[in-house]
């Protein structure tokens, strides 16, 4: 058993049918010695008396808020949560496996630049009685500071019969140098509590591997005289690291017909302009990627040919 | 510890081309190693990230763009002095700080070159003959060093008398390649910045 926060405790259980569970001793936080009784949650049934209460925690029915009283007055509370270990592996019931970029990906993180700021998000089908707490650091043995905000509900989607909820959090490395070569990964730890179930999820990454630039901005077309060709131009996104000559991007320009089946013409360039043939009803899209370290491409910025 | 914004003549920066070749070569070699050594811990998540140049060179700090010198997190206190007769910029405007940066890059390349050559000698003794260093990568390191054209003492190739542990050597190869790829990215960024300056 360990303390998650004041008066909240996590009991780790080897989870299998007929398991013996864990013996837990609760102590009433009071100088009183006599006349103390214990109850669980809203029940008035007295579970025991005395300054300590010994319980065998086996299932969720044994978890909850234990309260010690004296003469009708509440003395203290202890909330017991359960953390299930199923055949040597901690349970992952609360969050959905996003399966991207690989199986067992519960937390996904992205950074728009090298400033040390990043966003992580996760999915769940649970709508109520759910709380998250996020901590982060650079490295784990001698951790350096990363400050994370509160996790917030960022999107709701309907997936088949289920509603899916997306939560996200923003974090910022306390002293980040955009030009630094990372040797210790960022560690992100999310504590999830649903009713009386506790779970924790972790992700470990280098900022360089989670970079996804914003789409190029100010995408414009300039028709070339006496030609079906157009000059496409764009700019680096505002959120990208500076100076741009050091943090350079490379770009992919795509001409896409109205029908998805039509052949796509693609051009790759390090410049912020390109000359392409604009077909009727087609659209021109441009996306960006770090020129020197191949992390994710940005989303497309698009303009219609007409 | 920063790069001044100099204005070299256009087309006077041969190192940019060489550094791009270097990044391509080390990335290809790393990809090959990850595929060939699939049963070894060779992914970024599995290896220890070690920097063999740590405390010996300070390329990131010496080559810091001017715009980042205001960022206190970028200003590391390590002081290292380097030889200052680089010729990558065929221009007399090469400043002391730029020379410091380029000589730091040269020292990095020299250290990696020695490590890779030593490692290749061990890998050639492996009866499995599973993986060797790409000669193209070694040649590209050499070309960039020549383009940087610094006079520096030659470092003797390390020779080891004991029987090599091929498993450890292959894991060390992965560690070296990951670190060298990261350094090659920095070198490319620096060359791109200098070229635009």
């Amino acid at each position: 058993i360990w303390e998650l926060k004041k008066d909240v405790y996590v009991v780790e259980l080897d989870w299998y049918p007929d398991a013996p569970g864990e013996m837990v001793v609760l102590t009433c936080d009071t100088p009183e010695e006599d006349g103390i009784t214990w109850t669980l949650d809203q029940s008035s049934e007295v579970l025991g008396s005395g300054k300590t209460l010994t319980i065998q925690v086996k299932e969720f029915g044994d978890a909850g808020q234990y309260t010690c009283h004296k003469g009708g007055e509440v003395l203290s509370h202890s909330l017991l949560l359960l953390h299930k270990k199923e055949d040597g592996i901690w349970s992952t019931d609360i969050l959905k496996d996003q399966k991207e970029p690989k199986n067992k990906t519960f937390l996904r993180c992205e950074a728009k630049n090298y400033s040390g700021r990043f966003t992580c998000w996760w999915l769940t089908t649970i709508s109520t009685d759910l709380t998250f707490s996020v901590k982060s650091s650079r490295g784990s043995s001698d951790p350096q500071g990363v400050t994370c905000g509160a996790a917030t509900l960022s999107a709701e989607r309907v997936r088949g019969d289920n509603k899916e909820y997306e939560y996200s959090v923003e974090c910022q490395e306390d002293s980040a140098c955009p030009a630094a070569e990372e040797s210790l990964p960022i560690e992100v730890m999310v504590d999830a509590v649903h009713k009386l179930k506790y779970e924790n999820y972790t992700s470990s990454f280098f900022i360089r591997d989670i970079i996804k630039p914003d789409p190029p901005k100010n995408l414009q077309l300039k028709p070339l005289k006496n030609s079906r060709q157009v000059e496409v131009s764009w700019e680096y996104p505002d959120t990208w690291s500076t100076p741009h000559s050091y943090f350079s991007l490379t770009f992919c320009v795509q001409v896409q017909g109205k029908s998805k089946r039509e052949k796509k013409d693609r051009v790759f360039t390090d410049k912020t302009s390109a000359t392409v043939i604009c077909r009727k009803n087609a659209s021109i899209s441009v996306r960006a990627q770090d020129r020197y370290y191949s992390s994710s491409w940005s989303e497309w910025a698009s303009v219609p040919c007409s | 510890r920063n790069l001044p914004v100099a204005t070299p003549d256009p087309g006077m920066f041969p190192c940019l081309h060489h550094s791009q070749n270097l990044l391509r070569a080390v990335s290809n070699m790393l990809q090959k190693a990850r595929q060939t050594l699939e049963f070894y811990p060779c992914t970024s998540e599995e290896i220890d990230h070690e920097d063999i140049t740590k405390d010996k060179t300070s390329t990131v700090e010496a080559c810091l763009p001017l715009e980042l010198t205001k960022n206190e997190s970028c200003l590391n206190s390590r002081e290292t002095s380097f030889i200052t007769n680089g010729s990558c910029l065929a221009s007399r405007k090469t400043s002391f700080m730029m020379a410091l940066c380029l000589s730091s890059i040269y020292e990095d390349l020299k250290m990696y070159q020695v490590e890779f050559k030593t490692m290749n000698a061990k890998l050639l003794m492996d009866p499995k003959r599973q993986i060797f260093l790409d000669q193209n990568m070694l040649a590209v390191i050499d070309e960039l060093m020549q383009a940087l054209n610094f006079n520096s003492e030659t470092v003797p190739q390390k020779s080891s008398l004991e029987e090599p542990d091929f498993y450890k050597t292959k894991i060390k190869l992965c560690i070296l390649l990951h670190a060298f790829r990261i350094r090659a990215v920095t070198i490319d960024r620096v060359m791109s910045y200098l070229n635009a300056s």
Epitope: Y16, P17, D18, A19, E59, F60, D87, I89, D93, T125 | -
Partner: antibody
């Protein structure tokens, strides 16, 4: 004590369907994940499918994906395996089993796919 | 499609020490715990070892398990006639959990 009693096996023609059941007693069935495992005659053990305690997630072996469906009825304390488009290579003894460091197995039920 | 490899058979005379190996990889045994099962003819498998080296109550102490790196092994110290059976190791793969990964199985024969 924990008990898993299986039923539903038998002889079936290729292409036909069969449903296996596994009735649980002696524990809170709705709290635990459950597996199906099979063993072809003279062969080793092969995992078939898994279902979470609340039925929210199901996982299948590639060899049965799209043909077999694992389900559970927590109000009846019963686990099911619906098998469709059966093939000769599905011939095996099928076991249900609890998920956990200490597990309990059903007695097994024989499924023979033969024309 | 078995990823955990066991020797097809091992044998020993009563009282001898018999060991069965189970060889896997970094993503399975290297990252997860190992179980061992005993299966007597015509019966369901019976758990002998869980979490690499733990014995459930009721399993004789002549059975012991160990794990090192990407391999595990089961030892029967002082093998007895009633130990003649098939033995299977089981683990998980970190990418496909909770799918069970079983070993190829080993037939233990007690001679004489």
């Amino acid at each position: 004590q924990v008990q898993l009693v299986q039923s539903g096996g038998g002889v079936v023609q290729p292409g036909r369907s069969l449903r296996l059941s596994c009735a649980a007693s002696g524990f809170t069935f709705s709290s635990y994940g459950m597996h199906w495992v099979r063993q072809a005659p003279g062969k080793g053990l092969e995992w078939v499918a898994f279902i979470r305690y609340d039925g929210s997630n199901k996982y299948y072996a590639d060899s049965v994906k799209g043909r077999f469906t694992i389900s559970r009825d927590n109000s009846k304390n019963t686990l099911y395996l619906q098998m469709k488009s059966l093939r000769a290579e599905d011939t095996a003894v099928y076991y249900c089993k609890t998920h956990g460091s200490h597990d309990n197995w059903g007695q097994g039920t024989m499924v023979t796919v033969s024309s | 499609s078995y990823v955990l490899t066991q020797p097809p058979s091992v044998s020993g005379t009563p009282g001898q020490r018999v060991t069965i190996s189970c060889s896997g990889g970094r993503s399975n045994i290297g990252s997860n715990t190992v179980k061992w099962y005993q299966q007597l003819p015509g019966t369901a498998p019976k758990l002998l070892i869980y979490q690499n080296d733990q014995r459930p109550s009721g399993v004789p102490d002549r059975f012991s398990g160990s794990k090192s790196g990407t391999s595990a092994s089961l030892a029967i110290t002082g093998v007895q006639a009633e130990d003649e059976a098939d033995y299977y190791c089981q683990s998980y793969d970190r990418g496909t959990h909770p799918a069970l990964l079983f070993g190829t199985g080993t037939k233990v024969t007690v001679l004489g």
